[in-house]
Amino acid sequence: QNASRGRRQRRMHPNVSQGCQGGCATCSDYNGCLSCKPRLFFALERIGMKQIGVCLSSCPSGYYGTRYPDINKCTKCKADCDTCFNKNFCTKCKSGFYLHLGKCLDNCPEGLEANNHTMECVSIVHCEVSEWNPWSPCTKKGKTCGFKRGTETRVREIIQHPSAKGNLCPPTNETRKCTVQRKKCQKGERGKKGRERKRKKPNKGESKEAIPDSKSLESSKEIPEQRENKQQQKKRKVQDKQKSVSVSTVH
């Protein structure tokens, strides 16, 4: 910390002088500053065997200022403290100690963790993630047509990364199986197998999850009512089978 020192006025006699230079209000040749101008701190500086009074604009590192009507003094911070406002309020601890609410601690209290960069005890921060974004379109090898079994994906963002002792982030990507939209591929996006292109268009109301796999379409002799019942049964089975597969990087 910058401390501007009041220079001592050298005089022939060790008596008190009012003609002091710098920050001294009163001084003597032998003892240096005896008192300081307003807003300056009085401190004793050892020079050899002698202690000299000096006036400082702020207390040196490791000391704090105390105000009294007649004098402002510099007092040493606690032994484990580097800088402080007073003995009970440390602002920077000595090496090996962690600062918490103005105190220097060997170890951080329960529920807090040591930040070895700032040398402070900080709150444990747990991971926070956003809501899931909507599922992506169902695709198979990048195609959204044909009647194949494909996959759909959804993602969520990390809002708050965890601290060292915080809970890890849950998966941020999720993938599950689905059936690609039941529509014919256009010329440029055709599937490889010819039989996929011969299938009929689905009814407008059919959702991708309700689409049965190719085997159920082979029983074309059934009357429409029977076929519809079987499709509903198949839909339930497909939904039951759709267990989500999670893929994630641990953060």
Epitope: N2, S57, S58, G65, T75, F85, N86, N88, G102
Partner: antibody
Framework: QVQLVQSGAEVKKPGASVKVSCKAS????????FHWVRQAPGQGLEWIGY????????GYNQKFKNRVTMTRDTSTSTAYMELSRLRSEDTAVYYC??????????WGQGTTLTVSS | DIQMTQSPSSLSASVGDRVTITCKAS??????????MNWYQQKPGKAPKLLIY???NLESGVPSRFSGSGSGTDFTLTISPVQAEDFATYYC?????????FGAGTKLELK
């Protein structure tokens, strides 16, 4: 004489950030710690934190720890306080003050912050 | 945190009266023989102004009708005799521990 002059009033939307400045004159800027205190309308005073202008070390009230940043520019004798992720409860007058031997002896005129959507 | 409880929250007085405001800390604000207690005066639309530091010391330029006393957890600010310019809000503040805390204030009004 010691003077602390703060930046003008601010109106911000919730979620935004604000940076208030406090320019010091009349003394050696690095001699005293700068503190920031706020006062919500019709309420009492609340301490936010401090910065040592000599080395930039700062410390914050736990209540604001994750949202406040205090900096200084010794070349212009100016201290700054930035508050992020603003909410309506942050509507207040923000004061800077010099801290001399455990008391706030000089204060800025205050900066009014209004947070409203 | 050290809680500072000021009482009363408001009081009415006439010019020439003697008024006493009290501040009670939830724990001692003394250390090494020093009391880390300050008193401030604030007028509407203005910044606070330091009146008393270290419990009982009058800040330079503050009239001697203001006085402070107390130690440990119990402190008082006395104004005697009250002058017209003293009608304002008064706050106590402890600087012994992190975080620094203020009382809720006492509003001195003209009777």
């Amino acid at each position: 004489q010691v003077q602390l002059v703060q930046s003008g009033a601010e109106v911000k939307k919730p979620g935004a950030s604000v940076k208030v400045s406090c320019k010091a004159s009349g003394y050696t800027f690095t001699s005293y710690t700068f503190h920031w205190v706020r006062q919500a309308p019709g309420q009492g005073l609340e301490w936010i934190g401090y910065i040592y202008p000599s080395n930039g070390d700062s410390g914050y009230n736990q209540k604001f720890k994750n949202r406040v940043t205090m900096t200084r520019d010794t070349s212009t004798s100016t201290a700054y306080m930035e508050l992020s992720r603003l909410r309506s409860e942050d509507t207040a007058v923000y004061y800077c003050a010099t801290y001399f031997a455990n008391n706030f002896d000089y204060w800025g005129q205050g900066t009014t912050l209004t947070v409203s959507s | 945190d050290i809680q500072m409880t000021q009482s009363p929250s408001s009081l009415s007085a006439s010019v020439g009266d003697r008024v006493t405001i009290t501040c009670k800390a939830s724990q001692s604000v003394d250390y090494d023989g020093d009391s880390y207690m300050n008193w401030y005066q604030q007028k509407p639309g203005k910044a606070p102004k330091l009146l008393i530091y270290a419990a009982s010391n009058l800040e330079s330029g503050v009239p001697s009708r203001f006085s402070g006393s107390g130690s440990g957890t119990d402190f008082t600010l006395t104004i005697s005799p009250v002058q017209a310019e003293d009608f304002a809000t008064y706050y106590c503040q402890q600087s012994n521990e992190d975080p620094l805390t203020f009382g809720a204030g006492t509003k001195l009004e003209l009777k």
